[in-house]
């Protein structure tokens, strides 16, 4: 359903001081400037809707220009507790504490928040990414070491009058950026506590947050150039579907990925791309300015709507799912990586999706809104779209119920 409710104070309008407060690029994440401690220490922090810890580098590391020095902060409090976060690849570990935190280009407030001071990591920090920490904006259920560690946004809402909502506009450049260009470029906006009308066109359409852990949503249909993939919709959400600003690609469950690639290959068959391209290994290149966008299909994801039996669709262009990559060896060409990949943990709507849209994380009303981003990359023939309503029956059946592994289940 479109967003036609009456205006609520503080929830919408203009948030000039927060517009353009993000930098970075989809391949290495988008970051916001934050200050930690007293006196304030400035750090660039990755905006990640796929995790729930506020964690910052707190020891020297070859990829960090700077790090949080707890001993220099008069307001730091040690929680005398460690935290260890392993990923499929890599990990970080550190020590828990609290300190005063603010966002210079955000709401004019300072909050005491939990901070994981990262003392050791592997495959976490990215060389040249220009960020030194991560702001996990998801829910307490997935916080480490457990859900008793209050996430930053919960602390912010509790301690201030900031409404329980934030919105993200991630702006893909559409061309590769070198290091100096990234530092000088605008990456987008994180509007804390509201919605900025200047950042989108058309209407906002909302999908329910299925469960408050990740930002979990339900996909009910997938189309490639208007052709239905015709899979059992449970497959699209196996074992979950999440909106994650900390992931680069659109990641799809194995069966869905294979069907989608088959369909995209068929639609773009006027050119023969190597198998390695579909795997994300090989680049494809065209003479500068001649990328044949028209041979690649649009991809539509239908999301459960707010009203029974009603859905809406978000449509992305190849300009979103072909990621520009600079390579000196082929610098005379425009080269791209295929930014859709296979997942074993469900669908992940990463930067590839988010760069097409203004995305509203309306935690207060347990819903996520999508509208066409005012900064999305497109051509003169096609544009990203958010359209609805569509009639879709039995959408609840599309959600996958992850088997429980708690003690009560283990005892049965």
């Amino acid at each position: 359903e479109t967003d036609e409710e009456p205006e609520e104070p503080g929830r919408r309008g203009s948030f000039v001081e927060m517009v353009d407060n993000l930098r970075g690029k989809s391949g290495q994440g988008y970051y916001v400037e934050m200050t930690v401690g007293s006196p304030p220490q400035t750090l660039n922090i990755l905006v990640d809707t796929g995790s729930s810890n506020f964690a910052v580098g707190a020891a020297p590391h070859p990829f960090l220009h700077r790090y949080y020095q707890r001993q220099l902060s008069s307001t730091y409090r040690d929680l005398r507790k460690g935290v260890y976060v392993p990923y499929t690849q890599g990990k970080w570990e550190g020590e828990l504490g609290t300190d005063l935190v603010s966002i210079p280009h955000g709401p004019n407030v300072t909050v005491r928040a939990n901070i994981a001071a990262i003392t050791e990591s592997d495959k976490f920090f990215i060389n040249g990414s220009n960020w030194e920490g991560i702001l996990g904006l998801a829910y307490a259920e997935i916080a480490r070491p457990d859900d008793s560690l209050e996430p930053f946004f919960d602390s912010l809402v509790k301690q201030t009058h900031v409404p329980n909502l934030f919105s993200l506009q991630l702006c893909g450049a559409g061309f590769p950026l070198n290091q100096s260009e990234v530092l000088a470029s605008v990456g987008g906006s994180m509007i804390i506590g509201g919605i900025d009308h200047s950042l989108y066109t058309g209407s906002l359409w909302y999908t329910p947050i299925r469960r408050e852990w990740y930002y979990e949503v339900i996909i009910v249909r997938v189309e490639i150039n208007g052709q239905d993939l015709k899979m059992d919709c449970k497959e699209y959400n196996y074992d979950k579907s999440i909106v994650d600003s900390g992931t680069t690609n659109l990641r799809l469950p194995k069966k869905v990925f294979e069907a989608a690639v088959k369909s995209i290959k068929a639609a773009s068959s006027t050119e023969k791309f190597p198998d390695g391209f579909w795997l994300g290994e090989q680049l494809v290149c065209w003479q500068a300015g001649t990328t044949p966008w028209n041979i690649f299909p649009v991809i539509s994801l239908y999301l459960m709507g707010e009203v029974t039996n009603q859905s809406f669709r978000i449509t992305i262009l190849p300009q979103q799912y072909l990621r520009p990559v600079e390579d000196v060896a082929t610098s005379q060409d425009d080269c791209y990586k295929f930014a859709i990949s296979q997942s074993s943990t469900g669908t992940v709507m990463g930067a590839v999706i988010m760069e097409g849209f203004y995305v509203v994380f309306d935690r207060a009303r347990k819903r996520i809104g999508f509208a066409v981003s005012a900064c999305h990359v497109h051509d003169e023939f096609r544009t990203a779209a958010v359209e609805g309503p569509f009639v879709t029956l039995d959408m609840e059946d599309c959600g996958y119920n992850i088997p429980q592994t708690d003690e009560s289940t283990l005892m049965t």
């Epitope: 690849q89 060389n127 023969k272 090989q282 390579d327 060896a329």
Partner: antibody, heavy 116, light 107 residues
Framework: QVQLVQSGAEVKKPGASVKVSCKAS????????IHWVRQAPGQGLEWMGM????????KYNQKFKARATLTVDTSTSTVYMELSSLRSEDTAVYYC?????????WGQGTLVTVSS | DIQMTQSPSSLSASVGDRVTITCKAS??????VAWYQQKPGKAPKSLIY???HRYSGVPSRFSGSGSGTDFTLTISSLQPEDFATYYC?????????FGQGTKVEIK
């Protein structure tokens, strides 16, 4: 500029293992896959496998699947190729190469000699 | 696996000559073919990608053509530094495969 620097020559006995390193610099390490190619003396080039440094995903030539292991250390931008159960016919120069379109960049090569 | 068959396996030529090396794939590989130059004791050097595109810094005397199964590398005017072995490679499907090489020698 892009550089792939490999570890030095190795002499191994049959049945042993060898681990060759390839240190990358001059580009965003996690953006490009690393391949391994070998060349026996006086012979042509043979692709062994590849690894994605961003997530350690690997794909091998079936011929080497049982004996080759590719690993990555992103903190040092280094990829490793370990070959086990060496035999005399594994005597070759082993190259790492970076992906892009085909293999635009190659390491200088590491000679592995297997001899009893 | 896709076989890449190069011909000739060796050739003798003089400085200034036009040299053509061919490569035949055992199945359709589109334009997903690269060419490399290798000198004794050195690593291969990339010359051509996507059948006909020169990598940055490669002299314009090197050119490539072809699609599907038949590919050609041409050196328009052979220079002293061009005496080497040349390999074609298909990167259309795994496992990636190379031709057996063409050795260009001084006549």
């Amino acid at each position: 500029q892009v550089q792939l620097v490999q570890s030095g020559a190795e002499v191994k006995k049959p049945g042993a293992s060898v681990k060759v390193s390839c240190k990358a610099s001059g580009y965003t390490f996690t953006n490009f896959w690393i391949h391994w190619v070998r060349q026996a003396p006086g012979q042509g080039l043979e692709w062994m496998g590849m690894i994605d440094p961003s997530d350690s995903y690997t794909k091998y030539n079936q011929k080497f699947k049982a004996r080759a292991t590719l690993t990555v250390d992103t903190s040092t931008s280094t990829v490793y190729m370990e070959l086990s159960s060496l035999r005399s016919e594994d005597t070759a120069v082993y190259y790492c190469a970076r992906s892009g379109v085909a293999f635009p960049y190659w390491g200088q090569g590491t000679l592995v000699t297997v001899s009893s | 696996d896709i076989q890449m068959t190069q011909s000739p396996s060796s050739l003798s030529a003089s400085v200034g000559d036009r040299v053509t090396i061919t490569c035949k794939a055992s199945q359709d590989v589109g334009r997903n073919v690269a060419w490399y130059q290798q000198k004794p004791g050195k690593a291969p050097k990339s010359l051509i990608y996507s059948a006909s595109h020169r990598y940055s810094g490669v002299p314009s005397r090197f050119s490539g053509s072809g699609s599907g199964t038949d590919f050609t590398l041409t050196i328009s005017s052979l220079q002293p530094e061009d005496f080497a072995t040349y390999y074609c490679q298909q990167y259309n499907s795994y496992p990636y495969t190379f031709g057996q090489g063409t050795k260009v020698e001084i006549k």
